[in-house]
């Protein structure tokens, strides 16, 4: 605690500081999302969103943020993703986003309002001042896990998983030694917050790293572990090998081609 106190005084943390123009970026993204990307959310008041976002971390110790702090923001940014249209991902962020860029009716967390606002941003405040800290913010490993960014993603990831229904897809990286990583946000938060009364199937897409690789990565021990966790929660598990991520790139360039329209 004394170390935190000293660090908070001089505001020197192990991670990068708040993203430049953070308040402006949040407002700009909010307006773009609610007015252009998803006009059915045009009722959302972006100033209120920013106030709630700010209220979650400003004047609070950046190592003592709780999920409760983000509840007002979650309430304002509440959004319903249609059944069968939730795409989770783990270490495949770029591919997952290329997919939803084309398949516009499918949503990753970052395709929802709150995920879109915060994607790739860093933020934190300072204890007992109304300042945003642009110099440094707590690093999850070096400093503390209850920092504004980590708690935000844990909170919205939990909510995203809880609200999913029907068939849920997860895109996993077949190039990693642990295809399913229990320590990832997917493995530690989302998997455990899928609701069996709403979600009947979790289908994993294991992305191979190129053509010519004919292995069945759905047989990987970590996938078997995921299957066990999911099955114990009374959710049906299925897994598919996806051998052609190269096609993502082609379709990202020419999304209007009918070969880029796919039912999932």
């Amino acid at each position: 605690v004394s170390r935190w106190h000293q660090q908070s005084q001089r505001s020197q943390w192990g991670g990068r500081g708040t993203t430049d123009r953070f308040p402006e970026i949040i407002l700009e993204r909010c307006v773009e999302y609610t007015q252009t990307l998803l006009p059915e959310m045009r009722h959302v008041d972006c100033q209120n969103i920013w106030d709630a976002f700010k209220g979650a971390f400003i004047s609070k110790h950046p190592c003592k943020i709780t999920e409760e702090d983000y509840q007002p923001l979650l309430k304002l940014g509440n959004q319903t993703v249609p059944c069968n249209k939730t795409l989770l991902w783990s270490r495949t962020k770029h591919l997952a986003h290329q997919y939803t860029e084309i398949q516009r009716d499918v949503f990753t967390l970052e395709d929802t309002l709150l995920g879109y606002l915060a994607d790739d941003l860093t933020w934190c405040g300072e204890f007992e001042t109304s300042e945003i800290n642009y110099r440094s913010c707590p690093d999850w490993r070096k400093d503390c896990s209850s920092n504004p960014v980590s708690v935000f993603w844990k909170t919205v990831s939990r909510r995203f998983a809880e609200s999913a229904c029907g068939v849920v897809h997860v895109m996993l990286n077949g190039s990693c030694s642990n295809i399913f990583d229990k320590k990832s946000t997917f493995g530690s938060v989302e998997v455990h917050n899928l609701q069996p009364e709403k979600v009947h199937t979790l289908e994993a897409w294991v992305m191979h790293d190129g053509r010519g690789d004919s292995r069945d990565l759905c047989q990987d021990p970590s996938i078997k572990e995921l299957e066990l966790i999911i099955s114990k929660r009374n959710i049906t598990f299925s897994c598919k090998n996806i051998y052609r991520p190269d096609k993502f790139l082609q379709c990202a360039k020419t999304p209007e081609d009918s070969s880029c329209i796919s039912k999932i």
């Epitope: 997919y99 084309i102 897409w205 191979h208 053509r211 010519g212 690789d213 004919s214 069945d216 759905c218 047989q219 299925s238 897994c239 598919k240 090998n241 996806i242 051998y243 052609r244 991520p245 190269d246 096609k247 993502f248 082609q250 379709c251 020419t254 081609d257 009918s258 070969s259 880029c260 329209i261 796919s262 039912k263 999932i264």
Partner: antibody
């Protein structure tokens, strides 16, 4: 509507060569990967070769690797299969097929009517 | 490469249900497509991505895939459904099953 028309088949002696063509129309040819699939008389379907939309990547079944070459001319909306060192077991109807299925799964939504290649002395 | 095995033939009475199996080691881990081929004609896609029907294919055609078996089901079989049927998957290369002749008794 999508049309694929193969040509260039015929009778050829073992060890000989043949060049098949597939003229495509009714879709943006340069946006699609294309493939050749063959069917020996009274037998099942066998994938032979594939080529990416811009021709930068080519793929072959082990049975034809080193003997067949797939290519395309997007300005002419035409797919080719150059077949060298032909063997009796290459005798088949050769179909040109458009690869569909976006990025999650791969299948052939459109096929030509096929051209017969007979390798015999 | 995955090997896909189909029964050589399936016989069914008109109006009855025909089920064509396509077995392979953990085939449920791969997407499967099905083609119909009538004598002297090119194959026609009837099911893709396990269970999706292209436009123009009658609703009586359906597909499923799990474990070691993918299945094409033709409900209320009609005379025009008499044909050869091939399953196909992809695991770095395209693989076809040997084909099943559906005969309407």
């Amino acid at each position: 509507q999508v049309q694929l028309v193969e040509s260039g088949g015929g009778l050829v002696q073992p060890g000989g060569s043949l060049r098949l063509s597939c003229a495509a129309s009714g879709f943006t040819f340069s946006s699609y990967a294309m493939n050749w699939v063959r069917q020996a008389p009274g037998k099942g379907l066998e994938w032979v070769s594939g080529i990416s939309s811009w021709g930068s990547s080519t793929y072959y079944a082990d049975s034809v690797k080193g003997r067949f070459t797939i290519s395309r001319d997007n300005s002419k909306n035409t797919l080719y299969l150059q077949m060298n060192s032909l063997r009796a077991e290459d005798t088949a109807v050769y179909y040109c097929a458009r690869e569909d299925g976006s990025y999650m799964t791969d299948y052939f939504a459109y096929w030509g009517q096929g051209t017969l290649v007979t390798v015999s002395s | 490469d995955i090997e896909l095995t189909q029964p050589p033939s399936v016989s069914v009475a008109p109006g009855q249900t025909a089920r064509i199996s396509c077995s392979g080691d953990n085939i449920g881990h791969y997407y499967v497509s099905w083609y119909q081929q009538k004598p002297g004609q090119a194959p026609v896609l009837v099911i893709y991505s396990d269970s999706n029907r292209p436009s123009g294919i009658p609703e009586r055609f359906s597909g499923s895939n799990s474990g070691n078996t993918a299945t094409l089901t033709i409900s209320g079989t009609q005379a025009e459904d008499e044909a050869d049927y091939y399953c196909q998957s992809y695991n770095g290369t395209y693989v076809f099953g040997g084909g099943t002749k559906v005969e309407i008794k």
